[in-house]
């Protein structure tokens, strides 16, 4: 006579919210006679899931006909799965007892875990911009997934990054989980057009990972290089002062011309030229009439980029001795 075995073939069952879950249980022997009940959990606090005799279990149906005397299949189907249904389910054979039935043998259990997709990863950059050579942090967050196992990778322009730290919470059993990862990226001057990508792979995604991206343009500030040149004009005693502001990002730049310390013109960069790397160039010029100048003229160009401290570049226009007796005049 074969000894009764309770067979629960699946150790883990992944089910999405709203789906039905089939919990399989077969027995190897019809004997001894007695009912098979289903429980979630173990010990005195276990929850009765199905009992063919007692109780009302509207969401539970049996897979086979339990009224057939030769039935050896005690599998059940639970409909409309919710997160509250997660747990380990046991089919348990009882012998009739008085006043209570006596547990005879339990199956090994099937863990039902909620199969929930992770949310689309959201990548956020640093609160403030940083300049090239500095390191900035990007954070990737995704939540609501189950089971807990998940893979997260970082890429910069398609190249995998290695400097990142990832946490999945909570550490223990939960209905669903969240992931948070922080990657450290060293900025380069050409990173205006760069992109970081956070890629999340999970069993629910069938090999098609979710991605979230962030543009390094939101995190980088490339300070301008400044160059001042002067060119004498053929017509009369005029000098064209050209101020070139090169390779800066972002666009917001303000330029102020000062003549001997006095503001003579302020302008905001508007007609910019864009470089291949995404930085900008801008040229401003000032026409100075030197014929009427008595003293040397100190021309200062003050550049304020992206709210940073102003950078000054000065140029001295030397006036000839006989002109120093004349009154000065500048055309702007």
């Amino acid at each position: 006579e074969e000894e009764l075995q309770m067979i629960q073939p699946e150790k883990l069952l992944l089910v999405a919210v709203g789906e039905s879950a089939t919990l399989n249980c077969t027995v190897t022997s019809l004997l001894p006679v007695g009912p098979v009940l289903w429980f979630r959990g173990v010990g005195p606090g276990r929850e009765l899931i199905y009992n063919q005799k007692e109780g009302h279990f509207p969401r539970v149906t049996t897979v086979s006909d339990l009224t057939k005397r030769n039935n050896m299949d005690f599998s059940i189907r639970i409909s409309s799965i919710t997160p509250a249904d997660a747990g380990t389910y046991y089919c348990v054979k009882f012998r009739k007892g008085s006043p209570e039935n006596v547990e005879f043998k339990s199956g090994p259990g099937t863990e039902m875990a909620l199969r929930a997709k992770p949310s689309a990863p959201v990548v956020s950059g640093p609160a403030a911009r940083a300049t090239p050579e500095h390191t900035v942090s990007f954070t990737c967050k995704s939540h609501g997934f189950s089971p807990r196992d998940i893979t997260l990778k970082w890429f910069k322009n398609g190249n995998e990054l290695s400097d990142f730290q990832t946490n999945v919470d909570p550490a223990g059993q939960s209905v669903s989980y969240s992931i948070r990862s922080t990657a450290r990226v060293v900025l380069a001057p050409w990173d205006v057009r760069s992109q970081v990508t956070c890629e999340v792979a999970h069993v629910t995604l069938q090999g098609d990972p979710l991605r979230g991206t962030a543009n390094l343009s939101e995190a980088i500030r490339v300070p301008p290089t400044l160059e001042v040149t002067q060119q004498p004009m053929r017509a009369g005693n005029q000098v064209n002062i050209t101020y070139q502001v090169r390779n800066f990002y972002p666009q917001n730049l303000q330029l102020t011309w000062l003549e001997n310390g006095n503001v003579c013109r302020t302008e905001t960069a508007s007609t910019l030229t864009e470089n291949k790397d995404g930085t900008y160039n801008w040229t401003s010029w000032l026409l100075v009439n030197t014929s009427d100048q008595r003293d040397d003229v100190v021309l200062t160009c003050q550049v304020k980029h992206d709210g940073q401290l102003a950078v000054n570049k000065s140029l001295v226009l030397e006036v000839s001795a006989h002109q120093k007796d004349q009154s000065s005049d500048a055309t702007h």
Partner: antibody, heavy 119, light 107 residues
Framework: QVQLVQSGAEVKKPGASVKVSCKAS????????INWVRQAPGQGLEWMGW????????NYAQKLQGRVTMTRDTSTSTVYMELSSLRSEDTAVYYC????????????WGQGTLVTVSS | DIQMTQSPSSLSASVGDRVTITCRAS??????LAWYQQKPGKAPKLLIY???SLESGVPSRFSGSGSGTDFTLTISSLQPEDFATYYC?????????FGGGTKVEIK
């Protein structure tokens, strides 16, 4: 094949005890429970009690409590029902019946033992 | 205790007739009901268990139906060997109880 063979008819005096045996063959006693049912002459069926084939656990009808005892001997595959303090109204045919499945129906019955209580 | 009320207590029918016997439980017993046939001087014989499951070897003219409190045993075409007394029994909870029986006699 499965059989339940009961002991023979008994005639007892009021106040005496009777012990009816039910020998099981063709199956393992441990695997099935037994119900005892009686039937007075010309009357219907009356459930007397139940004994577990697994551990000898019992449950008796309230009206027989204190007078009935059900036991089992797994070594001989025999179940016993003893009724004490017999009265004339205990005159009946006594049946042992096997509990056939978890639906707890009686799928096999003994041939019955007539117990007559008469002074 | 769960009371089982069987009706009718007796009926007369002819061979080939369709016979219906009812059994009512005093409270819900789901499908925990068995039907037995007993002939004079013999032990009862199981016909139906779990309200509607036909016991192995029992002719298919016997059928059971019902759930909760109301149950029916039907003999679709009465045969000569079917003249007997029929009992329902609730197997839901102790104390197990039988209906009073229905005697099916030849008309």
């Amino acid at each position: 094949q499965v059989q339940l063979v009961q002991s023979g008819a008994e005639v007892k005096k009021p106040g005496a005890s009777v012990k009816v045996s039910c020998k099981a063959s063709g199956y393992t006693l441990n695997n099935y429970d037994i119900n005892w049912v009686r039937q007075a002459p010309g009357q219907g069926l009356e459930w007397m009690g139940w004994i577990s084939g697994y551990n000898g656990n019992t449950n008796y009808a309230q009206k027989l409590q204190g007078r009935v005892t059900m036991t089992r001997d797994t070594s001989t595959s025999t179940v016993y029902m003893e009724l004490s303090s017999l009265r004339s109204e205990d005159t009946a045919v006594y049946y042992c019946a096997r509990v056939g499945s978890s639906w707890e129906e009686n799928d096999q019955w003994g041939q019955g033992t007539l117990v007559t209580v008469s002074s | 205790d769960i009371q089982m009320t069987q009706s009718p207590s007796s009926l007369s029918a002819s061979v080939g007739d369709r016979v219906t016997i009812t059994c009512r439980a005093s409270q819900s017993i789901s499908r925990w009901l068995a039907w037995y046939q007993q002939k004079p001087g013999k032990a009862p014989k199981l016909l139906i268990y779990a309200a509607s499951s036909l016991e192995s070897g029992v002719p298919s003219r016997f059928s059971g139906s019902g759930s909760g409190t109301d149950f029916t045993l039907t003999i679709s075409s009465l045969q000569p060997e079917d003249f007997a007394t029929y009992y329902c029994q609730q197997t839901h909870s102790f104390p197990l109880t039988f209906g009073g029986g229905t005697k099916v006699e030849i008309k």
